[in-house]
């Protein structure tokens, strides 16, 4: 079943996907699509990489992590309720039926109306049900939400996986990771 992630209307949503290149520079094509992963390719492609660059994208979708080191996590800018649904991350490993396929469920919630700033978005206050990550500006706060049921003994090293990614400072020693490859 799909792992579920949540974001509020107007925020940026983050859908994690990683792989480990077989050797430095040995990148493989990746596609992201709206809808569950089909047998081949991605349906309704929103972003695609080749062996070197992002070579197709639609507006509001981008890779903010170090995709050339395998962090192909998708950011969706300024989400609306229509962005809810299943997304497919497909690591297109050469060879017949070698692809790694990951279905991620994005749930968009109506924006909370709050009269004044609260500690609601603070990492420690919200953990473990909600992770919030700082962006690089006031408009870029992201929510990586509703983690699958995990307990503290199961928490692994997302910060290591993210390496130079913008999330690393916030997630440090805590989080959940999808490991590919």
């Amino acid at each position: 079943s799909e792992v579920e992630y949540r974001a509020e209307v107007g925020q940026n949503a983050y859908l994690p996907c990683f792989y480990t290149p077989a050797a430095p520079g040995n990148l493989v094509p990746v596609c992201w699509g709206k809808g569950a992963c089909p047998v081949f390719e991605c349906g309704n492609v929103v972003l695609r990489t080749d062996e070197r660059d992002v070579n197709y994208w639609t507006s509001r979708y981008w890779l903010n992590g170090d995709f050339r080191k395998g962090d192909v996590s998708l950011t969706i800018e300024n989400v609306t309720l229509a962005d809810s649904g299943i997304y497919c991350c497909r690591i297109q490993i050469p060879g017949i039926m070698n692809d790694e396929k990951f279905n991620l469920k994005l749930v968009i919630k109506p924006a909370k109306v709050t009269p004044a700033p609260t500690r609601q978005r603070d990492f420690t206050a919200a953990f473990p049900r909600m992770l919030t990550t700082r962006g690089h500006g006031p408009a870029e706060t992201q929510t990586l939400g509703s983690l699958p049921d995990i307990n503290l003994t199961q928490i692994s090293t997302l910060a290591n996986e993210l390496r130079d990614s913008r999330l690393a400072n916030d997630l440090r020693d805590s989080g959940a990771t999808i490991r590919i490859g």
Epitope: P24, G25, L27, D50, E51, R52, D53, V54, N55, W57, S59, W62, L63, N64, G65, D66, F67, R68, T75, E77, D164
Partner: antibody, heavy 120, light 107 residues
Framework: QVQLQQSGPERVKPGDSVKMSCKAS????????MDWVKQSHGKSLEWIGY????????SYNQKFKGKATLTVDKSSSTAYMELHSLTSEDSAVYYC?????????????WGQGTSVTVSA | SIVMTQTPKFMPVSAGDRVTMTCKAS??????VAWYQQKPGQSPKLLIY???NRYTGVPDRFTGSGSGTDFTFTISSVQVEDLAVYFC?????????FGTGTKLEIK
Amino acid sequence: QVQLQQSGPERVKPGDSVKMSCKASGYTFTDYYMDWVKQSHGKSLEWIGYIYPNNGGTSYNQKFKGKATLTVDKSSSTAYMELHSLTSEDSAVYYCARSGYGNYYTMDYWGQGTSVTVSA
Amino acid sequence: SIVMTQTPKFMPVSAGDRVTMTCKASQSVGNNVAWYQQKPGQSPKLLIYYASNRYTGVPDRFTGSGSGTDFTFTISSVQVEDLAVYFCQQHYSSPSTFGTGTKLEIK
């Protein structure tokens, strides 16, 4: 040391084609991409495309599809770019440049440039 | 294509000045921005890649920063030999695109 030696200046007529070369030395030719960049007089840089000598794979800027053809000769470590159906808009300096994974596919070594003048 | 808007176009400087130029991408490019120096009659030279990584042999007076859509290139103390045109480049997507350049000129 790494060197990219480009062929000399070209003066051609409108409608003609021109093929320029870029001879690489000082590194393993098949381990790096070869990118090509256009610089019109006093203007910025435009990426034309790349070729990966290891497998001959190419990628082109849509703007230059049909205008430029990239090829390599692995035996002589030489990359080529042919420009077709030339017009005055194609008058520019054309650079070959090496790019590789270590620098995130930025261009760390450049040829000296080949000047192309299209004139009747 | 992603548009890289580079400012200013010209920058009058004196030796020893601290100079800063900026590049704004039309959409997020992560950290995938490079900076090049081009002197008259020469080929461009790579100075910075992946937003802030100084290329081998580049003096530490050259620094880059930024992420997402906004990037900055700084020369902490301009030397006479730094007079040149500086270009930013996004190396996130294909086609790769460059800024229009910033020309450092003597004040």
